[in-house]
């Protein structure tokens, strides 16, 4: 279970077509 203080920070993963981009790369989202 995530600690409360971590909830405002993004989690970053590799994906394609994410983060408003057409290619593959790292994408960080809260």
């Amino acid at each position: 279970r995530r600690r409360r203080r971590d909830t405002h920070f993004p989690i970053c993963i590799f994906c394609c077509g994410c983060c408003h981009r057409s290619k593959c790369g790292m994408c960080c989202k809260t």
């Epitope: 983060c19 290619k23 790369g25 994408c27 960080c28």
Partner: antibody, heavy 121, light 107 residues
Framework: QVQLVESGGGVVQPGRSLRLSCAAS????????MHWVRQAPGKGLEWVAV????????YYADSVKGRFTISRDNSKNTLYLQMNSLRAEDTAVYYC??????????????WGQGTMVTVSS | CYELTQPPSVSVSPGQTASITCSGD??????ASWYQQKPGQSPILVIY???KRPSGIPERFSGSNSGNTATLTISGTQAMDEADYYC??????????FGGGTKLTVL
């Protein structure tokens, strides 16, 4: 100015441990992912590990997985690399590098000066 | 295991254009970054997201990426551009790949 300063390198015997540190200044450390990248003498760059904003969001290269641990202390603006079960092939200059800011941090935009780790008996 | 292949060396005359290639499986489907490293120094980011230049990097540095090849182009090459150049791309969350590096010699 924005700066990363590594420390903790040295000569260590195979199988032993070493902890590297990277002191950050000139930017809000907690707002950036941080990497370790190494370079064996006369060789190219090799990515080692990354730790993103949340301490649990971290990834390792297969070559170091299970032996190295990346961590950060945002209150001290410091990045760490705990290296256990060291091997001769771990001999390299170790750089800490900052991930780009933003939603899509593909590149390494700031690099430290590096610290040399030599694994030898 | 993914690999990015660069030519070991490229030579160029001052004022001419240097092109350094970086080839890998479906390279054009991911974002390429390029780094410059001079002897005894740390790497410097010169191109990211295929074509973008960080602030402070001269306009003579440009990049492209399509198919299986990313290319770093240095127009009007200067003596100060002599260095090793590395491409880099992500292939998964746990797989950041650097090319083997290209030594650029300005004749």
């Amino acid at each position: 100015q924005v700066q990363l300063v590594e420390s903790g390198g040295g000569v260590v015997q195979p199988g032993r441990s070493l902890r590297l540190s990277c002191a950050a200044s000139g930017f809000t450390f907690s707002n950036y992912g941080m990497h370790w990248v190494r370079q064996a003498p006369g060789k190219g760059l090799e990515w080692v590990a990354v730790i993103w904003y949340v301490g649990s969001n971290k990834y390792y290269a297969d070559s170091v997985k299970g032996r190295f641990t990346i961590s950060r202390d945002n209150s001290k603006n410091t990045l760490y690399l705990q290296m256990n079960s060291l091997r001769a092939e771990d001999t390299a200059v170790y750089y800490c590098a900052r991930a780009q800011e933003g939603m899509a941090p593909d590149a390494f935009d700031i690099w430290g000066q590096g610290t040399m780790v030599t694994v030898s008996s | 295991c993914y690999e990015l292949t660069q030519p070991p060396s490229v030579s160029v005359s001052p004022g001419q254009t240097a092109s350094i290639t970086c080839s890998g499986d479906k390279m054009g489907e991911r974002y390429a970054s390029w780094y410059q490293q001079k002897p005894g120094q740390s790497p410097i980011l010169v191109i990211y997201q295929d074509t973008k230049r960080p602030s402070g990097i001269p306009e003579r540095f440009s990049g492209s990426n399509s198919g299986n090849t990313a290319t770093l182009t240095i127009s009007g090459t200067q003596a100060m551009d002599e260095a090793d150049y590395y491409c880099q791309a992500w292939y998964s969350s746990t797989n950041v790949v650097f090319g083997g590096g290209t030594k650029l010699t300005v004749l």
